[in-house]
Amino acid sequence: HTAAQDNCTCPTNKMTVCSPDGPGGRCQCRALGSGMAVDCSTLTSKCLLLKARMSAPKNARTLVRPSEHALVDNDGLYDPDCDPEGRFKARQCNQTSVCWCVNSVGVRRTDKGDLSLRCDELVRTHHILIDLRHRPTAGAFNHSDLDAELRRLFRERYRLHPKFVAAVHYEQPTIQIELRQNTSQKAAGDVDIGDAAYYFERDIKGESLFQGRGGLDLRVRGEPLQVERTLIYYLDEIPPKFSMKRLTA
């Protein structure tokens, strides 16, 4: 697909190998791990990025209270199965034939089972709540400046349409970014909120996925915004199905 022709690299994904053997001898970039060609003009899907990562040599009322159905990614890294479009397959299994169902961002949404476990459809994560705590600063950031800067970041760095950034909440030192994107709202070519959130998460951790760019330098009116803790909550269009044992644990 498209890539920087002069030196044949993928600006939006450093977890690729690019070579001049694409159509017409053009630069073509393939994700590590899956070997799938990626479109370097946009973000790569989280599933392909995880696969590449596993294969690579390596005021109170303004804050949102995550719903009881919100998922947090407690399982950490795994080597996912991706579908032909690079999205997560609804059912994931490990080497020991333990299987579970995931949502569109690859987070487990059922108890673990065996190979007989059925996951009928990939359930879409339509609401993502990114909960950040910033390091102490001389004073609180101006809310509207912070809001504008984070919206600009998601629009320009992650190419996420502004309409999908539903809200930015702030109560020092906590910042919450709400991303919302229903199946019906997502048009062809739109960046997925799950992919944008994953790129943002890796940026915040100082593990940028962008090729050759410096790390994320977030500033609000010239003041550095340094994040010391990140929590991401995922809300699915259909609530997850966990046993009572887990819910009461």
Epitope: C8, V17, D21, R30, S34, A37
Partner: antibody
């Protein structure tokens, strides 16, 4: 002009290993994937895996994972395919090719015979 | 793994006539821009030779009687006017995802 020259035929005993080489010339070796393909006598083509010499990245067909090892020596512009724990069904011609799918240049092939 | 199925397994065509070989993938191997499908010719005792890359791009030096078409899961290699030197086995291969599997081959002969 682009050329891929492979090492000569080998006869091996079951359980042994074989290492086939593929010497590239006429292009920048580190810029292209090198793929390896097996062709058993009278049979079709089977993709083994590929290697990107520029970074040493490898991909393997699950069927050959654990037995096939792909390496490259960039100073010698040479790619290698080592196959271990040989058995009779490994008797085949092994080809190297430049490129991922759609290999545009191929080596002449190396016949590996596994026989006790 | 993506399974590539060629049809027919063998084909006999008169000199000067059109030869058509089909290849079906078990899932789509196309995006809106490209199809990751390639065609090879192999003659006895020789390595495969790339004819068509990305479904329809003719490799340089390949006669223009060879053409490729198709997208999604169904692809076709066509030889518009068969010549004696076209007798060979033809293979399709995808490069959508690992492993990059081949079709089983189609043997083309002169009728």
């Amino acid at each position: 002009q682009v050329q891929l020259v492979q090492s000569g035929a080998e006869v091996k005993k079951p359980g042994a290993s074989v290492k086939v080489s593929c010497k590239a010339s006429g292009y920048t070796f580190t810029n292209y994937w090198i793929g390896w393909v097996k062709q058993a006598p009278g049979q079709g083509l089977e993709w083994i895996g590929d290697i990107y010499p520029g970074g040493g990245y490898t991909n393997y067909n699950e069927k050959f994972k654990g037995r096939a090892t792909l390496t490259a020596d960039t100073s010698a512009s040479t790619a290698y395919m080592e196959l271990s724990s040989l058995r009779s069904e490994d008797t085949a011609v092994y080809y190297c090719a430049r490129g991922t799918g759609g290999g545009d240049y191929w080596g002449q092939g190396t016949l590996v015979t596994v026989s006790s | 793994d993506i399974v590539m199925t060629q049809s027919p397994d063998s084909l006999a065509v008169s000199l000067g006539e059109r030869a058509t070989i089909n290849c079906r993938a078990s899932q789509s191997v196309s995006t809106s821009s490209y199809s990751y499908m390639h065609w090879y010719q192999q003659k006895p005792g020789q390595p495969p030779k790339l004819l068509i890359k990305y479904a329809s791009n003719l490799e340089s030096g390949v006669p223009d009687r060879f053409s490729g078409s198709g997208s999604g899961t169904d692809f076709t290699l066509t030889i518009s006017s068969l010549q004696a030197e076209d007798v060979a086995v033809y293979y399709c291969q995808h490069s959508w995802e690992i492993p990059y599997t081949f079709g089983q081959g189609t043997k083309l002969e002169i009728k």
